[in-house]
């Protein structure tokens, strides 16, 4: 009788878990005269076999990581070895089991981070691979920090994206990391498969050494300028520097002055562009901004203070 395990020759798909010893037939194909025998071709890998009477089976455990789909063809032949029906495609999909452990690509990673870097902005990625199917929990990886050394006041300065392995600073790390106090840290990071959710998951660990570098994006000391300078303008009065080359600098006048006598070049050098008059305005406060190539601010603005010094340029009045 036709049913789940037997029937005529037609295209079919079967799903079989990898790693399981064969326990039953896959299918029994029924021959229509003059067909008397069946033949199997395709990606058999000497695992799949069809007996002359049409019994399709496999003779040893499958491995999805070797081949995830076996594309086979079955034909029905007559007594003269001539194909009467088919060949028809028979697809064997090999279902994944968790038989591979995740492995970090490196046993040790090294990276550096600037103090005061933006929280959540990745500065290093750790990466693990798992040969199991990423579309199933077996191949879904979960990263976490196991230990941070040193651990100061029980505060985590570093965080990891559980899915991508991206390491960044926490809010506390952004505020408190100081290379003068502690220039290096070590993290032990684990990766688990099964999305980290199962006690049966496999895991691996790696070590990450992190150097904390000084943040040179700092507000310069207040500048004192003599009023009514006769030197040729523009005159460089101070400078700011982003931590990496390629930043785009600009100045922001929060006071919305009718005339703003300062400029900045792409090296971060700040200039006064015309003589200042203390009697008109005795102090300026404005901001230097560093942006990336897309115009996105790289960090917080720096406050620039310019104090205008008096010269004796006004007669006394009674």
């Amino acid at each position: 009788q036709e049913g789940k395990f037997s029937g005529p020759l037609k295209p079919m798909t079967f799903s079989i878990y990898e790693g399981q010893e064969p326990s039953q037939i896959i299918f029994q194909f029924k021959a229509n005269p003059p067909a008397v025998t069946f033949e199997l071709t395709g990606e058999t890998d000497n695992i799949f076999v069809i007996e002359r009477e049409g019994l399709l089976y496999y003779n040893r455990a499958l491995d999805r990581e070797t081949r995830s789909t076996h594309n086979l063809q079955v034909a029905a032949l007559d007594a003269n070895g001539i194909i009467v029906e088919g060949p028809v495609p028979i697809t064997i999909k090999v279902k994944d089991i968790n038989d591979n452990r995740p492995t970090f690509l490196q046993s040790k990673y090294e990276g550096s981070v600037r103090q005061n870097s933006r929280p959540g902005k990745p500065f290093l990625y750790v990466n693990a691979t798992d040969l199991d199917d990423p579309a199933t929990p077996n191949g879904q990886l979960y990263y976490q920090i196991v230990i941070q050394l040193p651990m100061i006041n029980n505060v985590m300065y570093f965080q990891i994206n559980n899915k991508t392995g991206a390491i960044s600073l926490t809010r506390e790390g952004s505020q408190e990391l100081n290379p003068a106090k502690n220039p290096s840290y070590n993290l032990v990071i684990s990766v688990k498969d099964m999305g980290g959710q199962s006690e049966n998951s496999f895991s691996d660990t790696t070590s990450v050494d992190i150097i904390v570098t000084e943040n040179i994006w700092k507000a310069p000391k207040p500048v004192e300028m003599v009023e009514n300078s006769t030197d040729p303008h523009p005159i460089k009065i101070t400078q700011v520097r982003w931590n990496d080359p390629g930043a785009q600098y600009s100045l922001v006048d929060k006071e919305k002055l009718p005339r703003f006598p300062f400029s900045i070049d792409q090296e971060g050098d700040i200039y006064v562009t015309q003589p200042l008059d203390r009697e008109e305005k005795d102090a300026y406060v404005f901001y230097a901004v560093a942006k990336d190539e897309y115009g996105k601010p790289l960090s917080y603005p720096l406050e620039i203070h310019v104090k205008v010094k008096d010269i004796n340029d006004n007669p006394p009045t009674c």
Epitope: P34, A75, A79, G81, I82, I83, V84
Partner: antibody
């Protein structure tokens, strides 16, 4: 020696039927298939089908089903092909050929051919 | 149905020439290919079966080769009785199909 002797040329009218014969000698008739092949004027060869005299089983090219009927007379070691509802399209030389039973199924001996002309 | 394409459809050659005739199937036929010779009088003879096996009584100047869907018949040194029509036949799957033939003529 093995021989396949076919009937002589035939001239028949459209709509009629004709029976072409192929007499085998020099081997055990029931142990081999008899195949039939058509060759239209100036054309190549086209396989019509086979009959296995031992069992009487047949296999036809779908294209010739309803046109050709194969049978045998074991007592005279003769194979026959009946062609029915004839049209001018059926004008051709028809060959019988012995097919080795089992694998490989090659045609090792051929008849001399029977010329059929369908004309009013 | 499996189509069999023979090339060339006709060719001229001289006595003693080495010639190769080609037969291409529209799909793989696993070596189930035979070559037949038809003389001008109409008589047909099996030359090669299953790609490369020489039928008994056929001169050794005839040889066959090929696999998958591409096959060829080679005559190493033409003799006068070799000028004829040559057909390939696939018997991998029903219906059995012949090529359209190659006519070998004396130059």
């Amino acid at each position: 020696q093995v021989q396949l002797q076919q009937s002589g040329r035939d001239l028949v009218k459209p709509g009629a039927s004709v029976k072409i014969s192929c007499k085998a000698s020099g081997y055990t008739f029931t142990d081999y298939h008899i195949n039939w092949v058509q060759q239209r004027p100036g054309q190549g060869l086209e396989w019509i089908g086979w009959i296995f005299p031992g069992s009487g089983s047949t296999y036809y090219n779908e294209k010739f089903k309803g046109k050709a009927t194969l049978n045998v007379d074991k007592s005279s070691s003769t194979a026959y092909m009946l062609l029915s509802s004839l049209t001018s399209e059926d004008s051709a030389v028809y060959f019988c050929a012995r097919g080795k039973s089992g694998y490989p199924f090659y045609f090792d001996y051929w008849g001399q051919g029977t010329t059929l002309t369908v004309s009013s | 149905d499996i189509q069999m394409i023979q090339s060339p459809s006709s060719m001229f050659a001289s006595l003693g020439d080495r010639v190769s005739l080609s037969c291409r199937a529209s799909q793989g036929i696993r070596g189930n290919l035979d070559w037949y010779q038809q003389k001008p009088g109409g008589t047909i003879k099996l030359l090669i079966y299953s790609t490369s096996n020489l039928n008994s009584g056929v001169p050794s100047r005839f040889s066959g080769s090929g696999s998958g869907s591409d096959y060829s018949l080679t005559i190493s040194s033409l003799e006068s009785e070799d000028f004829a029509d040559y057909y390939c036949l696939q018997r991998n799957a029903y219906p059995l199909t012949f090529g359209a033939g190659t006519k070998l003529e004396l130059r």
